[in-house]
Structure formats: C-alpha cells, structure tokens
C-alpha cells in the first residue's frame, strides 16, 4: 500500500524502527491483558 504523507517527515525515517518496536510491545501487553481477562471470565 502507498506510504502516508507523514512518511516524508524525517522523524518517520529516524524513529521507524523504535516506533514499530514500541507498537509490538504495546500489542504484546494488550494480548497479555486479554489472556488474563479471559482466564478470569473463564473461571
């Protein structure tokens, strides 16, 4: 898919990797929270 206009911002280039890592970390935390919630509901 086409890159959004913000990809032209130098910041996008310099922080691309760390932002992707931060997002992955956030998703992992969300998944962990969801699992915990399912465990509680499942009981």
């Amino acid at each position: 898919s086409e890159e959004p206009p913000i990809s032209l911002d130098l910041t996008f280039h310099l922080l691309r990797e760390v932002l992707e890592m931060a997002r992955a970390e956030q998703l992992a935390q969300q998944a962990h929270s969801n699992r915990k919630l399912m465990e509680i509901i499942g009981k």
Epitope: I6, L10, L14
Partner: antibody
Framework: EVQLQQSGPELVKPGASVKMSCKAS????????MKWVKQSHGESLEWIGV????????FYNQKFKGKATLTVDKSSSTAFMQLNSLTSEDSAVYSC???????????WGQGTLVAVSA | DVLMTQTPLSLPVSLGDQASISCRSG???????????LEWYLQRPGQSPRLLIY???NRFSGVPDRFSGSGSGTDFTLKISRVGAEDLGIYYC?????????FGGGTKLEVK
C-alpha cells in the same frame, strides 16, 4: 504559514498535574509528527517525546517516561502534553515543535511556562 | 545518551566580526543510513529557537548565507561571518542520529 499556538502559563502545586495544548495551523496536521521539548530556566533544551497524529504512536525519551503523556485531537489539529506528579524540577518552559523532510525541529510554538510552587 | 559539548560557553564579539562556535559529540553521530543529523539553532532573547542549519552544513530556508556549518564524525563548527545585532542570542547544536536526541549546552553570542 506554519503556526504552533500554545496554551498560556500555568502555576501549579507540587504533586498536581497539568495539561497544555499546541494548536497547529497552516499545514495538514496529520502529515507531520509533533515533538515536545523542555527548557528549564537558563538551561539547555531536552527532547521529551514525539507523537504521530495519524495513529497516536508515541515514543518518549526514557527520562520522561511516566512524567509526560502525549495525545492529539485530530478534529481540532491540536496536540496535548500532560505532566503529572509535578515537582520543582518540572518548572520550565515546554515547547511543541514540528519538523520537515530535512530537519527535526523546523517550526516551534512560543512555549508554555509551567511554574511549580507551593 | 550522546553528550553534545559546546565551546565556548560565552562568545563576546564586535558587530561585523566573524564568530565561530564548536560542538563536539561524545561519539560519532553518523547515522546508520550514512547521514549525519547535526543541526544548529539560534534562540534570541525571549524567543523560541529557530532552525539555522540541518545535516551539518545545509542552511534552512530564509537563513542568510553568512551562516555556515561544517564538520564530520564528532567535531562540528558553526561560523557566522559579519555578525549583526539580530544574530545575538544562544546557539545550540543538536544531534538526531542516536536516540535519545540531544542538544548541546548552548553558546551565548553577545556584544563585546
């Protein structure tokens, strides 16, 4: 003309929180990241963090994790920064800034003075 | 964190003279993409910082050609030929090659 208009000065008590704003105009708000910078009185500049107005992705300078919270409101082209558990060390001028395809801090807001005092 | 050290702390000049400000980084600030993200800013009294130079030696739009940046690796210089009253203030170098991004401590350009 690119303009970043920041909210007015704040006098707050230790332990309290403060939320300041930065209203962008003269460009498409979602086309550029918004950064925040701290300048303590008579001292140098410190980069706090950056937010992508498109999707809310945020990256903080480790030093300011837990101290600053960055958000945006796309409908009003406004970026916000909240500072919590304030101490005298947080007394400073806080500025928002925007980059370009070539540089990181090409356009600056006028700054918001935060004074923490009992 | 990459420490950016500026010298001198204060630089008294006569208007019309040339001024030279040094900035040294604690480690190389060549980015993995080959570029060096070294920028220079001027903060006039009571104002917000203003971008002068990006990527070591490129003048930002509207910046007069009396401002020039040079250097590589860890050593960088900002030169101002024919200093005018509007050039007085605090100059900061900045690196965006390594996270966290960091600024130098500043050099105050003032009238002798």
């Amino acid at each position: 003309e690119v303009q970043l208009q920041q909210s007015g000065p704040e006098l707050v008590k230790p332990g309290a929180s403060v939320k300041m704003s930065c209203k962008a105009s003269g460009y498409t708000f979602t086309d550029y990241f918004m950064k925040w910078v701290k300048q303590s009185h008579g001292e140098s500049l410190e980069w706090i963090g950056v937010i992508n107005p498109n999707n809310g992705d945020i990256f903080y300078n480790q030093k300011f994790k837990g101290k600053a919270t960055l958000t945006v409101d796309k409908s009003s082209s406004t970026a916000f920064m909240q500072l919590n558990s304030l101490t005298s060390e947080d007394s400073a001028v806080y500025s928002c800034a925007r980059g370009t395809d070539r540089a990181l801090f090409a356009y600056w807001g006028q700054g918001t003075l935060v004074a923490v005092s009992a | 964190d990459v420490l950016m050290t500026q010298t001198p702390l204060s630089l008294p000049v006569s208007l019309g003279d040339q001024a030279s400000i040094s900035c040294r980084s604690g480690q190389s600030i060549v980015h993995s993409d080959g570029n060096t993200y070294l920028e220079w800013y001027l903060q006039r009294p009571g104002q917000s910082p203003r971008l002068l130079i990006y990527k070591v030696s490129n003048r930002f739009s509207g910046v007069p050609d009396r401002f020039s940046g040079s250097g590589s690796g860890t050593d960088f210089t900002l030169k101002i030929s024919r200093v005018g009253a509007e050039d007085l203030g605090i100059y900061y170098c900045f690196q965006g090659s390594h996270i966290p991004w960091t600024f130098g401590g500043g050099t105050k350009l003032e009238v002798k």
